[in-house]
Interface confidence: low
C-alpha cells in the first residue's frame, strides 16, 4: 500500500488523506472524536467571529460591527428591532476573504426587504483553515451567533421569529448550531448547498436539521452519488430542494465555464455548481415575478419521468425566499429544472403518451422530440428523455420544460429521430436488422398525448390531427391538436396562488 498523502483540493474543500486509507468523512470513518471539538488555539484567534450590520447595499460601506453587551452601535446604525433580521453566514474559505456572492446576496436582501437588518457573520479567521479544522470551528461560531441572538432578545420588540439565518456550504451547519443553541426558536434557516464532507450521515445534532428553526428550507446544488459530494446529499430540512436533480447544474459544464472565464478548470465547475444555490436564492429575491416551483418526489429519476408535477396536499412550493412554510413536512425532497442563468425559472410539463402498438422496436430505444405550440410562443425542439424504456400498451410519462411561457398550448409536434447518432447505435440497428430481416419497419402507434402544466396545474388532452393516422416511424413526425373535449382542468391548486 502506498504511503503517499495526496492532497485533494477543490474550490470549496481541501483534504489530506493517506492513499488507500479510508477518507476521514462520510457516514463511515468519521472523525467522531475530533469532530466539532474546537481546538483551543483556534478559539484564541481574535476577533474570531464578528457581526457586520450592513447599512447599505454598497460593499464599500464598512457597515457597523455589533458586539454583545454594546448597545451603542445598534442605535448609531439604526438597527430596527421590529424588522426582519437576516444573518448571512459564509462557509469554508481558501482565500480568507469574502467572495462576490456575498455582495449579491446582501444587495438582493436590501432591495427586497428595505427595512430589514442584514448582518454578515464574519468568521473568516476560523474558516480560513484546513477544512477539517474549519468544521471543528462551526460549533464555536454557532455559539457566538446564539449568544448574539440571546442578547438581542433582551431588547424590547426584538423577536426571534423575525430572524432568518442564511448559511452557505459550511455556513449552513453553523446556522444549524446557532438555531440549536439559542434560547427559543429562530423563525427560519435557509441552507444553501450545506457542506457534505464530515456531515453526510451525521447525527441530527451535529448538522443542520429541521429541529434548528421553525422552518428549515434547503437548496442542494452539488451532490454526487459517486466521488466527492461537496454538498450534502441527505435531506436536512423541512423541505429539501434539488434543482436539476441536485447535481449537474446547467451552465456549469466545463465547456460553459471555459467559455466564460480566462482559465477554466474543474475547480471553476465545482464553484459554479456549489454556488448556484446562492444565485437561485438571490433570483428568488430579485425576480419575485418569476418564481421557480419545485415538486415533491421520492427521487430524481421519478421526477425526470414527469411523474411528480402535483400541487395537491402541498406537494409543490416556491423555491428560495418565497418558499411557503411547511412545518408538517420533514425531509421532504422536491425537484425542479432551471435555466442556466437568472432568471432561473422554467415551465414544467408532464407528457403522458399512450403507446397502443409497437412494431419491430429492436434493441435500441427510439429518440423522440416534441415541439409545443402555444398562444404566447412556440417552444424549441425538446427531447423526450426516456428514463427506462418505452412500454407498449401502457402510458409512458415524460418531463419536458421550456424556458419561455408558451401560454395555452394549441398543438404538439412529435418527431422520431431518424438517423442514429452514434456508432454504437448504428451497430445495434444493424444487429436488429440482421435478426429481423423480413420485417425491418419500426413503427409506433399513438392516439393521444395528455399534458399537464406544473406551473398552472392545467391538464389538456391532444389528439392526432388525422384520427386515421396514428403511426409514427423513424424520421417521421406526428401532429397533435387539442381534442374537442380536451380542455380539462382538475380541482388542483395552482402554485401561483400559493405565493406567501
Amino acid at each position: 500500500m502506498s504511503n503517499s498523502v495526496p492532497l485533494l483540493c477543490f474550490w470549496s474543500l481541501c483534504y489530506c488523506f493517506a492513499a488507500g486509507s479510508p477518507v476521514p468523512f462520510g457516514p463511515e470513518g468519521r472523525l467522531e472524536d475530533k469532530l466539532h471539538k474546537p481546538k483551543a488555539t483556534q478559539t484564541e484567534v481574535k476577533p474570531s467571529v464578528r457581526f457586520n450590520l450592513r447599512t447599505s447595499k454598497d460593499p464599500e460601506h464598512e457597515g457597523c460591527y455589533l458586539s454583545v453587551g454594546h448597545s451603542q452601535p445598534l442605535e448609531d446604525c439604526s438597527f430596527n428591532m421590529t424588522a426582519k433580521t437576516f444573518f448571512i453566514i459564509h462557509g469554508w474559505t481558501m482565500s480568507g476573504i469574502f467572495e462576490n456572492w456575498l455582495h449579491k446576496l446582501v444587495s438582493a436582501l436590501h432591495t427586497r426587504e428595505k427595512d430589514a437588518n442584514v448582518v454578515v457573520v464574519d468568521w473568516l479567521p476560523l474558516a480560513h483553515q484546513l477544512y477539517t479544522d474549519a468544521v471543528n470551528n462551526t460549533r464555536v461560531v454557532g455559539h457566538s451567533i446564539a449568544r448574539m441572538l440571546d442578547w438581542l432578545q433582551e431588547k424590547d420588540d426584538f423577536s426571534l421569529g423575525n430572524v432568518h439565518l442564511i448559511g452557505y456550504s459550511l455556513g449552513a451547519h453553523v446556522a444549524g448550531y446557532a438555531g440549536n443553541f439559542v434560547k427559543g426558536t429562530v423563525g427560519r434557516i435557509t441552507g444553501l448547498d450545506p457542506a457534505g464532507p464530515m456531515f453526510e450521515g451525521a447525527d441530527i445534532h451535529k448538522r443542520l436539521s429541521p429541529d434548528d428553526a421553525d422552518f428549515v428550507d434547503v437548496l442542494h446544488t452539488y451532490t454526487r452519488s459517486f466521488g466527492l459530494s461537496i454538498g450534502i446529499q441527505m435531506p436536512v430540512g423541512h423541505i429539501d430542494i434539488y434543482p436539476n436533480g441536485g447535481d449537474f447544474q446547467p451552465g456549469c459544464g466545463l465547456n460553459d465555464v471555459l467559455g466564460s472565464i480566462a482559465y477554466g478548470t474543474i475547480t471553476e465547475v465545482v464553484k459554479c455548481e456549489h454556488e448556484r444555490a446562492v444565485h437561485l436564492f438571490v433570483d428568488s429575491l430579485v425576480n419575485q415575478d418569476k418564481p421557480s416551483f419545485a415538486f415533491q418526489c421520492t427521487d430524481s429519476n421519478r421526477f425526470k419521468k414527469g411523474i411528480c408535477l402535483s400541487c395537491r396536499k402541498n406537494r409543490c412550493n416556491s423555491i428560495g425566499y418565497n418558499a411557503k412554510k411547511m412545518r408538517n413536512k420533514r425531509n421532504s425532497k422536491m425537484y425542479l429544472k432551471t435555466r442556466a442563468g437568472m432568471p432561473f425559472r422554467v415551465y414544467h410539463y408532464q407528457m403522458k403518451i399512450h403507446v397502443f402498438s409497437y412494431k419491430n422496436m429492436g434493441e435500441i430505444e427510439p429518440t423522440f422530440y416534441v415541439t409545443l405550440y402555444g398562444t404566447n410562443a412556440d417552444s424549441q425542439t425538446l427531447p423526450l428523455e426516456i428514463v427506462e424504456r418505452i412500454e407498449q400498451n401502457a402510458t409512458n410519462t415524460f418531463l419536458v420544460y421550456t424556458e419561455e411561457d408558451l401560454g395555452d398550448l394549441l398543438k404538439i409536434q412529435l418527431t422520431w429521430e431518424g438517423a442514429s447518432q452514434s456508432w454504437y447505435n448504428l451497430w445495434k440497428e444493424f444487429r436488429s436488422y440482421l435478426s429481423q430481416p423480413r420485417n425491418p419497419g419500426r413503427e409506433l402507434n399513438i392516439r393521444r398525448i395528455r399534458v399537464k402544466s406544473g406551473e398552472t396545474q392545467r391538464k389538456l388532452t391532444f389528439c392526432t390531427e388525422d384520427p386515421e393516422n396514428t403511426s409514427i416511424s423513424p424520421g417521421r413526425e406526428l401532429w397533435f391538436r387539442k381534442c374537442r373535449d380536451g380542455w380539462r382542468m382538475k380541482n388542483e391548486t395552482s402554485p401561483t396562488v400559493e405565493l406567501p
Epitope: N52, P59, E60, E62, S95, I97, F98, N100, L102, K104
Partner: antibody, heavy 119, light 106 residues
C-alpha cells in the same frame, strides 16, 4: 506577492482623453473592488470611484461622474480609468487601490500615474 | 459630503517625543482609517477600524476616537515616522480623506 502596476506618465493637451491602466497580480482579481484616487500636487487625496471586477458594477464620486469612466478586463486582470475633456485641473497623480469587500480599507496601492495637461 | 478636517496641518516633534494628531468629521462616522505617505511614494494603510494597526506598523502607533472625533498617537517619535498622515472615512459616499498632517522631525 500582491502588486498593482500602473501605466507610465502622460503628457496631454487640454480637451484630450486618457486611459490609465492598473494591472493586478498576486491575488484573485475578481474578489476585490478596485478604487481610484486623485492626488493633486502637494494636496490631499480625493476618491474618484470604484469598480467591482466580478460583475462590472461601478460607484462614482458625483464630482467625477462626467469626467471618469472605470472599466476592467478580467482576462488580463487589469483595471482602467478613462479621463476625458482634460483641463489643467486634472493635473495630478492618480492611484489605483485594492479594497476587500466588507473588510473596509485600501490595503494595496499602485505606484501612481502622473498626468500632465499642458498646451 | 462628509468633510474631514485634520489638525495640525504641519507639526514637528523631537525624537522620543509623544505625538498626537486629530481628525474631525463634519458628520459622525463609524470608523476611521489612517494612511501614511512619504514623499514620492504611494500612501500605505497604517490604521484601520479606528484602532487596528496594519501589518508591519510599529506598536508605538495607536488610534482612537468615536463619532466625529478621532486621533492618531505615536508614543515615542522615531526618525522613520516623518511623513504625511491622512485620515479617511468609508461610512458614507463619497469616501473622503482629510487634508493631511505633515509630521517633521524637529
Amino acid at each position: 506577492e500582491v502588486q498593482l502596476q500602473q501605466s507610465g506618465p502622460e503628457l496631454l493637451k487640454p480637451g484630450a482623453s486618457v486611459k490609465i491602466s492598473c494591472k493586478a497580480s498576486g491575488y484573485t482579481f475578481t474578489e476585490y473592488t478596485m478604487h481610484w484616487v486623485k492626488q493633486s500636487h502637494g494636496k490631499s487625496l480625493e476618491w474618484i470611484g470604484s469598480i467591482n471586477p466580478y460583475y462590472g458594477g461601478t460607484s462614482y464620486n458625483e464630482k467625477f461622474k462626467d469626467k471618469a469612466t472605470l472599466t476592467v478586463d478580467k482576462s488580463s486582470n487589469t483595471a482602467y480609468m478613462e479621463f476625458r475633456s482634460l483641463t489643467s485641473e486634472d493635473c495630478a497623480v492618480y492611484y489605483c487601490a485594492r479594497y476587500g469587500n466588507y473588510v473596509g480599507y485600501f490595503d494595496y496601492w499602485g505606484q501612481g500615474t502622473t498626468l500632465t495637461v499642458s498646451s | 459630503e462628509n468633510v474631514l478636517t485634520q489638525s495640525p496641518a504641519i507639526m514637528s516633534a523631537s525624537l522620543g517625543e509623544k505625538v498626537t494628531m486629530s481628525c474631525r468629521a463634519s458628520s459622525s462616522v463609524h470608523y476611521m482609517y489612517w494612511y501614511q505617505q512619504k514623499s514620492d511614494a504611494s500612501p500605505k494603510l497604517w490604521i484601520y477600524y479606528t484602532s487596528n494597526l496594519a501589518p508591519g506598523v510599529p506598536d508605538r502607533f495607536s488610534g482612537s476616537g468615536s463619532g466625529n472625533s478621532y486621533s492618531l498617537t505615536i508614543s515615542s517619535m522615531e526618525g522613520e515616522d516623518a511623513a504625511t498622515y491622512y485620515c479617511q472615512q468609508f461610512t458614507s459616499s463619497p469616501y473622503t480623506f482629510g487634508g493631511g498632517t505633515k509630521l517633521e522631525i524637529k
